[in-house]
């Protein structure tokens, strides 16, 4: 029967005994960084080439003992999870590979950035398809390498990596923490981070997503028939590798900003026990475990966002953190967070040409984080409206005041530390749904955007008494581009978008008293596009 | 059930060119493999190659390289083997068999081909 | 390539007799990896194709009855029929197909004393 990894990433419309997707990403030519492969196993024979190229460190122990299987293990099955002929995922994908990783698995910063550039040579010399780079391999944190893959996934390729098996966060490694590289993290069968020994899965806000990665079975170097059951992030990262080439076979013309958020709109929701994560990376990490669109034609009609947070600012009173979106993506709204409660809210502001979203932390405050909402919007133009602090006791009030400019977020930022501690709430007037309001004591910021049949609305979601989460969602059809809180008191602990959920966290029940104060109401902007949608309908 | 029905027997002479058939029922053709195994009079059994109906990909015992062609239409869930050119050293039962990564040993045999290679 | 050589070419055990087949490969055919052994038997009867006996060296494929039993690994195997019956009659291979080329050994005839 079908191995249970292959089922698990399989949507219900292809379920049968066997794993037979249509197209199996022959269109696309996956490499892979690692150890040695056993290239005549039967599961990848004529599938994978191996090229001349390597580069690793000595094997360290006097004693060492190169046993020719033991040193291609690693990466042979890797090889096989991605394309093997049984139990592969896009098994119609070619592979080339790359010593980079010793017998004993181990490799060097700079055996890895000459692979890279080993890779964007071969890419200019003979251009093919779309290329996927697949580095399952974690090292400490490194600039150099996490700049090499940026200027990698710049010339169009899309890397894949490993989130590490530290059980740790995955932002303190590389390439792990390039936010050019899609990070993947490891899950079981029943869903759950993977453990390995008294580690496991890496999370954090920078893993993308999870994939199965625990008793997986593919190819052996023992034998050309022998098959092994291994775990770890590079298993999952394999698989997150297999369903690019799936994808970018069915749509060679995708970018990797688009690439990304397929796989992210595409994977399970919500099927991880976030208690196995420290409990201040719960909400960092992405509850999502990657799986393969139900169809092999792209959802193009579909308005994609995903949610990017930010490394935390740290404590002092003027830290400030920033949230960026991916080049081809488009910032439609910012929101902030803090533990403590503690912050001065958040902005949009222009940065080297982009807009990105930054939060500040408030005096005694533990710190802040800052969450962008990045959309795939073509011909979108997008700009922020700000407002001062008003004088008015009605509290300050921003819309979008351009011809065909809709609202698709809204934020707002103060001076003052104890904001709104003894302010009635703020209530938006009926009738007004286009426009962001806030304490007068705050400025606020409007993200107002124009895009061919682009159309948002407002969906709020008010509960009188204390709270500590209050959640609104956007209907089937529409995707959620902006999450914000009304009001701004100072129980509010902030807001962020959970797929298509706006989730406004407040402080424990019990420490607010059940006062007109306690009144939480969760503000999400949904909006789609008519034009996609019909763009869409036109190609089928 | 799950089969593997072989084409009928051949007379041919030297020189001349064969391709015999192997049908899979039963079965998901595309995710195992097919085998051919040669079986001369009165001998033992030799393992010729196999393919993946899958990609068409072929693995050939070195002994039979160059000799014989393996390969498969998908479509209509067929095998085959097929000589250009008939030696009479060529003539035996030639059987296909089928196996799958967690079970690499044959587990179903058609029921041969007796090929004849005379003048 | 992984020889396999058999013993004996022949066998003739009275009806209810014990029938011992051995098989040895030229290197090992067993794997850390699972642990298992790669090594198969098959029954050929006069007219019919090889049949599957015992597979992973030991376990009785579905049908098969369990007089016929398997053992051994790395490079010595043997096939033991407990109570040898009329219907068993066959020429009996083994086979290894942990790489390639997959290779045979040469036979044991089976006949009744």
């Known amino acids: 029967s079908i191995p249970w990894n292959l089922e698990r990433i399989t949507p219900p419309r292809y379920r049968a005994d066997e794993y037979q997707p249509p197209d199996g990403g022959s269109l696309v030519e996956v490499y892979l960084l690692d150890t040695s492969i056993q290239s005549d196993h039967r599961e990848i024979e004529g599938r994978v080439m191996v090229t001349d190229f390597e580069n690793v460190p000595e094997e360290d122990g006097t004693r060492f003992h190169r046993q020719a299987s033991k040193c291609d293990s690693h990466g042979t099955h890797l090889a096989g999870v991605v394309s093997g002929r049984d139990a592969g995922v896009a098994k119609g994908a070619s592979m080339r590979s790359l010593r980079v990783l010793n017998c004993q698995g181990k490799g060097t910063v700079s055996g890895t950035l000459i692979g890279l550039e080993f890779i964007r040579k071969s890419q200019l010399v003979q251009p093919v398809g779309p290329l996927v780079v697949l580095l399952p391999l974690a090292g400490g944190y490194s600039r150099v390498l996490n700049a090499a893959c940026q200027r990698l996934a710049r010339a169009g390729v899309v890397l894949v990596t490993a989130a590490g098996n530290f059980r740790d966060d995955a932002c303190l490694y590389s390439p792990a923490s390039a936010p050019e590289v899609i990070t993947v993290g490891a899950t079981n069968a029943q869903d759950q981070p993977v453990t390995l020994g008294t580690l496991g899965t890496n999370f954090g806000r920078c893993v993308d997503l999870f994939a199965p990665g625990e008793d997986i079975i593919g190819a052996s170097s023992d034998c050309s028939t022998c098959f092994v059951s291994q775990s770890g992030t590079s298993q999952a990262a394999a698989h997150v590798a297999g369903i690019a080439a799936m994808m970018l076979s069915a749509e060679p013309e995708l970018t990797l900003a688009e690439l990304r958020q397929r796989l992210i709109h595409f994977s399970a929701k919500d099927v991880i026990n976030e208690a196995w994560f420290p409990e201040d990376q719960r909400v960092l990490t992405p509850n999502l475990v990657a799986a393969l669109p139900p169809s092999t034609h792209g959802a193009g009609w579909q308005l994609f966002c995903r949610t990017v947070w930010s490394a935390h600012s740290g404590p002092t009173r003027m830290a400030t953190a920033v949230a960026r979106c991916a080049p081809d993506e488009e910032l439609l709204s910012c929101s902030s967070f803090s533990r403590s409660g503690k912050r001065r809210g958040e902005r949009m502001e222009a940065q080297g040409g982009k807009l990105v979203c930054r939060a500040h932390n408030a005096f005694g405050g533990e710190g802040v984080y800052a969450i962008a909402r990045c959309c795939l919007l073509p011909q979108a133009n997008c700009s922020v409206h700000t407002a001062p602090p008003a004088e008015a006791s009605m509290g300050t009030r921003v819309h979008c005041h351009q011809q065909g400019h809709v609202l698709t977020g809204c934020s707002s930022h103060w001076e003052v530390e104890d904001l709104g501690t003894h302010k009635p709430p703020v209530l938006r007037p009926r009738g007004q749904p286009n426009q962001c309001v806030g304490h007068r004591e705050a400025s606020i910021h409007a993200s107002c955007c124009h895009a061919p049949g682009l159309e948002c609305k407002v969906k709020e979601h008010g509960i009188p008494a204390p709270q500590e989460q209050v959640t609104v969602a956007c209907e089937e059809g529409w995707t959620l581009t902006g999450c914000s809180a009304l009001p701004g008191t100072s129980h509010v602990l902030g807001a962020y978008a959970v797929d298509n959920t706006c989730v406004v966290r407040s402080r424990d029940v019990s420490t607010t008293g059940s006062t007109s104060e306690g009144a939480v109401t969760a503000v999400a902007i949904c909006c789609r596009s008519r034009h996609l949608a019909q763009a869409s309908q036109e190609l089928q | 059930q799950v089969q593997l029905v072989q084409s009928g027997a051949e007379v041919k002479k030297p020189g001349e060119s064969l391709k015999i058939s192997c049908k899979g029922s039963?079965?998901?053709?595309?995710?195992?493999?097919i085998s051919w195994v040669r079986q001369m009079p009165g001998k033992g059994l030799e393992w010729m190659g196999w393919?993946?109906?899958?990609?068409?990909?072929?693995h050939y015992n070195p002994m039979f390289q160059g000799q014989v062609t393996i390969s498969a239409d998908k479509s209509i869930s067929t095998a085959y083997l097929q000589w250009s050119s008939l030696k009479a050293s060529d003539t035996a039962m030639y059987y296909c068999?089928?196996?799958?990564?967690?079970?690499?040993?044959?587990?179903?045999w058609g029921q041969g081909t007796l090929v004849t290679v005379s003048s | 390539d992984i020889v396999m050589t058999q013993s004996p070419d022949s066998l003739a055990v009275s009806l209810g007799e014990r029938a011992t087949i051995n098989c040895r490969s030229s290197q090992s055919v067993l794997y850390s990896s699972n642990n298992k052994n790669y090594l198969a038997w098959y029954q050929q009867k006069p007219g019919q194709p090889p049949k599957l006996l015992i597979y992973w060296a030991s376990t009785r494929e579905s049908g098969v009855p369990d007089r016929f039993s398997g053992s051994g690994s790395g490079t010595d195997f043997t096939l033991t029929i407990s109570s040898l019956q009329a219907e068993d009659v066959a020429v009996y291979y083994c086979q290894q197909y942990s790489s390639f080329p997959i290779t045979f050994g040469q036979g044991t005839k089976v006949e009744i004393k």
């Open positions: 393919i993946y109906p899958g990609d068409s990909y072929t």
């Open positions: 039963g079965y998901s053709f595309t995710d195992y493999y």
């Open positions: 068999a089928r196996d799958r990564w967690s079970r690499p040993y044959f587990d179903i």
